[in-house]
């Protein structure tokens, strides 16, 4: 019994659902009650999901396995995994018995996009030319590993004094943290670059230094001047710091946090004690570093409606402030294809593509192209739909009239994270039919 | 369309400087580096080296430094490559190359001038 | 710097055929590009991110490696394929591109 599954790695955003695709070619007059099927970890043989006499024997894997009833009669027994985890990983076999028995092995690769790129600078004021500084660049909540790169801009690469560290949260998430040290000349921009392998994704940041005395006066509150970019559901920290002079002690500070917009509290520490969060018990100051002059602000489970910008005043003997903006992001499911019609397709025929990608924020740019790269702008109609916590769907129609074949793509790309999310779909001159049966 | 055109062939004496242009259209001028590349006749690729054209900086390959000067007028959207005290060695088809990207791994160079042959002979 | 030495230099093959070139660096280097160049045309980017097919590359070209060696490969030869490939790193500066292989329609 010839079984087939896809030749390369499934790969699947932790927290999506992924399709484990298996296919058999059933007889004629095959019946439900002659088929085992089996689903297990390759390397372990856990039982993930059984077929077996007839009936769906239900998920052995925390519940979150289905196959597609439907469609197994077919030939179909593909494996619905939801709500991926790092930990799910690896190959996954799938046997099916009629009379014979035939099995194959399909891989899953999970993946999770990097965040944008944090830049903290260590001495940050003050700063001459011929000073040694060490720039960090951090990234968040990414797997696999990252390849980090840092270039100067001119875009030539930096590869000396360069130490990059990756660490594992306990969902397998990789918090990344490389650090530069250079030798400032009289100014120069710094770039880090956080690569995703598997998902190609580069995320990006650059710091300009342009090293001068600082001015004397108001307490110099510093913010990124870049936007802070934090993936829905991850925490984020707004970076603001001030100068402490010696003998500063924290009994003389005021720091407020609030919207900038609106001005509503979100945070505060007053009176030599922090106040607490205002903003529905999901912020924290630094308590150990308020001291050093360190006054950011964490912000867990970060929401859609979390979006925008957010002042730090801090008042001592002098008073300053400095706004800092949030912008929050979520990936782009990959790209989900069907036509329409969808059997007996020969050149001539007029097909309707559709693209789907979904929970993603903000609203996705959507191309299409041709086999060749070449794009595709006429008979495109995309619509974008957000639901209750502000995440887009996204949906793509193409029409087009076949030729003799073609591949036609869709991407789907976060503006922010800049993530390209891509489908394809192959339609050769014969009539055929897809999905292309097994 | 992006497009880089570079100035015309240069027929020059020993010792003699020459100034090549690479005009460009299609594409924000200051939002990419500009690179110089020398072929010599028959022979491989050389980088010559880097400018970035939005704050001047530049960055050249050891070999060229001393040889090679990069510059740019943002107001025409050209770069311009001087090269002097000038020997036969200096003869080759030299090209003007934009990168893919700036802030990413694509460091591929997705255009490139039609090259200026330049001959040094006395 | 790191040298990015080719091989073969040159080689010739018929329609059809398999064709197998090679990009060797000296030390290791992140990802490799490639480009075509054609007799009195300006070189044409290929390959990037070692394995990545540039915009109107034909899909019988293939790229593939990592650390000091890499490779293109062309399933099957076709006469247009007929030009000099160059590979390119900038992991580390100064920028620097491979020799050339030659390849031409036997």
């Known amino acids: 019994l010839e079984v087939q599954v896809p030749e390369d790695p499934v790969v699947a955003l932790v927290g999506t659902d992924a399709t484990l695709c298996c296919s058999f070619s059933p007889e004629p007059g095959f019946s439900l009650a002659q088929l085992n099927l089996i689903w297990q970890l390759t390397d372990t043989k856990q039982l993930v999901h059984s077929f077996a006499e007839g009936q769906d024997q239900g998920s052995a894997y925390a519940n979150r396995t289905a196959l597609f009833p439907d469609l197994l009669a077919q030939g179909n027994a593909s494996l619905r995994l939801q709500r991926v985890r790092v930990a799910d990983e690896g190959s996954f076999t799938c046997f099916v018995s009629i009379r014979d028995f035939g099995s194959a092995a399909v891989s899953l690769q999970v993946a999770a996009p990097y965040s944008k790129p944090s830049m903290t600078l260590e001495p940050n004021k003050d700063l001459r030319p011929g000073d040694t500084v060490t720039i960090t660049c951090s990234s968040y909540q990414g797997y696999p590993e990252a390849e980090v790169f840092w270039q100067d801009g001119q875009g030539v690469p930096l590869t000396g004094n360069v130490t990059t560290s990756q660490m594992a949260n306990e969902q397998g998430l990789f918090d990344v943290h490389s650090i530069l040290r250079v030798v400032l000349g009289a100014n120069g921009t710094y770039s880090c670059l956080v690569r995703n392998p598997v998902l190609q994704q580069d995320a990006h940041s650059s710091v300009t230094i342009t090293p001068q005395r600082s001015p004397t006066g108001a307490v110099e509150v510093q913010v990124p001047e870049d936007p802070v970019v934090a993936l829905v559901g991850t925490d984020a920290t707004l970076r603001c710091s001030f100068s402490p002079e010696p003998g500063f002690s924290l009994a003389q500070l005021n720091l407020i946090w609030q919207l900038t917009d609106t001005k509503q509290l979100v945070h505060s520490f007053t009176e030599g004690r922090d106040q607490g969060s205002a903003y529905a018990n999901r912020t924290a100051l630094f308590p150990d570093l308020l001291a050093q002059g360190n006054a950011s602000l964490r912000l867990q489970r970060v929401r859609v409606a979390d979006e925008g910008s957010f002042t730090c005043f801090v008042s001592i003997r002098d008073f300053g402030s400095a706004a800092v903006s949030l912008q929050v992001a979520a990936p782009y499911s990959k790209p989900s294809m069907t036509l329409e019609p969808n059997k007996d397709l020969r050149p001539g025929d007029t097909v309707t593509i559709t693209c789907s990608s979904y929970r993603g924020y903000p609203e996705a740019e959507v191309f299409w192209q041709d086999g060749q790269g070449v794009p595709l702008t006429g008979n495109v109609t995309t619509s974008q739909m957000a639901n209750e916590q502000g995440l887009f769907d996204v949906h793509s129609v193409l029409r087009v009239v076949l030729g003799a074949n073609g591949t036609y793509s869709c991407l789907v790309r976060n503006p922010v994270l800049q993530q390209d999310a891509h489908g394809s779909v192959t339609i050769t001159g014969q009539p055929m039919t897809f999905p292309p049966e097994a | 369309e992006v497009q880089l055109q570079q100035s015309g062939p240069e027929l020059v004496k020993p010792g003699a400087s020459v100034k090549i242009s690479c005009k460009t259209s299609g594409y924000t001028f200051t939002e990419y580096t500009m690179h110089w590349v020398k072929q010599s006749h028959g022979k491989s690729l050389e980088w010559i080296g880097v400018i970035n054209p939005n704050n001047g900086g530049t960055t050249y390959n050891q070999k060229f430094k001393g040889k090679a000067t990069l510059t740019v007028d943002k107001s025409s959207s050209t770069a311009y490559m001087e090269l002097r005290s000038l020997t036969s060695e200096d003869s080759a088809v030299y090209y003007c190359?934009?990168?893919?990207?700036?802030?990413?791994?694509?460091?591929?160079?997705?255009?490139w001038g039609q090259g200026t042959t330049l001959t040094v002979s006395s | 710097q790191i040298v990015l030495t080719q091989s073969p230099a040159l080689m010739s093959a018929s329609p059809g055929e398999k064709v197998t070139m090679t990009c060797s660096a000296s030390s290791s280097v992140s990802y490799m590009y490639w480009y075509q160049q054609k007799p009195r045309s300006s070189p044409k980017p290929w390959i990037y991110?070692?394995?990545n097919l540039a915009s109107g590359v034909p899909a019988r070209f293939s790229g593939s490696g990592s650390g000091t060696s890499y490779s293109l490969t062309i399933s099957s030869m076709e006469a247009e394929d007929a030009a000099t490939y160059y590979c390119q790193q900038w992991s580390s500066n100064p920028l620097t591109f491979g020799a050339g292989t030659k390849l031409e329609l036997k």
């Open positions: 190359a934009r990168p893919h990207s700036l802030l990413r791994l694509r460091r591929e160079f997705d255009y």
């Open positions: 991110l070692t394995s």
